[in-house]
């Protein structure tokens, strides 16, 4: 025998009486599939979350993060504070990258400049808090009289962090 509730479309739920009447979802609730025994409570976008899509009787609300924050997790389940390029987020707030490290994103952590000499290359453009160094040809490849920028410390070795 077919479950009478299966006739209840999205946006409704199946009543508990003998007639199994399909009842519209109450305000601030939804059912996205047919045959549901109850409607789900709509997600509320509060605090650092803002509404991207309103809840309807057939679909949940969707949130994103307010300006100055970025989404993490499925369906933007978390919001994390942005920092500027050249910074990283700590518990005490956004801190500038230490000398010899950089961050080219508004999120994440600083990482060390590339050590060009590990690849036998020279530094063509110095690194900054926001940008990695640019490596150029090896010192031996440079024409007489040409000079390259001295590689900055700390050295970045693959598999190691600055301490």
């Amino acid at each position: 025998l077919q479950d009478p509730c299966s006739k209840c479309p999205a946006g409704t739920f199946c009543g508990k009486n003998k007639n199994q009447i399909c009842i519209p979802c109450p305000p601030n609730s939804f059912s996205s599939t047919s045959g549901q025994k109850a409607c789900d409570i709509c997600r509320q976008c509060k605090g650092v979350f803002r509404t991207r899509k309103e809840c309807s009787s057939t679909s949940n609300a969707e949130c994103d993060c307010t300006p100055g924050f970025h989404c993490l997790g499925a369906g933007c389940s978390m919001c994390e504070q942005d920092c500027k390029q050249g910074q990283e987020l700590t518990k005490k707030g956004c801190k500038d990258c230490c000398f010899g490290t950089f961050n080219d994103q508004k999120r994440g952590i600083c990482r060390p400049w590339t050590n060009c000499s590990l690849d036998g290359k020279s530094v063509l453009v110095n690194g900054t808090k926001e940008r990695d160094v640019v490596c150029g040809p090896s010192p031996a490849d440079l024409s007489p009289g040409a000079s390259s920028v001295t590689p900055p410390a700390p050295a970045r070795e693959p598999g190691h962090s600055p301490q």
Partner: antibody
């Protein structure tokens, strides 16, 4: 939607080499850290290390430094964890996860069994 | 590196409050995060940055972090909360993530 899909279970002998993978999709793979986490049978989570796929910068837990190698190929949105010589004590579930502090997405795990 | 210590197990009756501690030197100076792991599944964030709850995680989950202890509190614990719980922190000394040893939460009855 964001997904991390790991390679299948492996059964190996001590001394053999192994490389397992974690393929990301649904986001800018190059600009998010990927971490690897070990869980030995019946035990807790252990953070092994992380990689920034954009430039393959890696950083290891002192406990795993020199024991494993983490790498990535951003052109195919894949991170790797490899061993050059497996030991029985490497038997564990290995998870990749997106992030360095808050791990918001996890792979389904790769079970590695090392037995003679 | 910082070491995070959790009680191996905590038992609680349904409807009661469960508290899981995570102790480490000055952990209050760093963000603490909490993960729930059920058998055969990958971990899931239940609290991030000390006290923030991801959407979809019930309001009964809350967190705090100061001094040497971070705490996960589950008010009105339900049977479905039975799982392993792990605290973690990212330390800017060594640039590493550390997990606590994990706590098995048992909901009695």
């Amino acid at each position: 939607q964001v997904q991390l899909v790991q390679s299948g279970a492996e059964v190996k002998k001590p001394g053999e080499s192994l490389k397992i993978s974690c393929k990301g999709s649904g986001y800018s793979f190059s600009t998010y850290w990927i971490s690897w986490v070990r869980q030995m049978p019946g035990k807790g989570l252990e953070w092994m290390g992380k990689i920034y796929p954009g430039d393959s910068y890696t950083n290891y837990s002192p406990s795993f430094q020199g024991q494993v190698t983490i790498s990535a190929d951003k052109s195919i949105s894949t991170a790797y964890l490899q061993w050059s010589s497996l030991k029985a004590s490497d038997t564990a579930m290995y998870y990749c996860a997106r992030g360095y502090g808050i791990f918001d997405y996890w792979g389904q795990g790769t079970l590695v069994t090392v037995s003679s | 590196d910082i070491e995070l210590t959790q009680p191996p197990s905590v038992s609680v009756a349904p409807g009661q409050t469960a508290r899981i501690s995570c102790s480490g030197d000055n952990i209050g100076d760093q963000y603490a995060h909490w993960y729930q792991q059920k058998p055969g599944q990958a971990p899931v964030v239940v609290i991030y940055q000390d006290k923030n709850r991801p959407s979809g995680i019930p309001e009964r989950f809350s967190g705090s972090n100061s001094g040497n202890t971070a705490t996960l509190t589950i008010s009105g614990t339900q049977a479905e909360d039975e799982a392993d719980y792990y605290c973690s922190t990212y330390t800017f000394v060594g640039f590493t993530t550390v997990f606590g040893g994990g706590t098995k939460l048992t909901v009695l009855g």
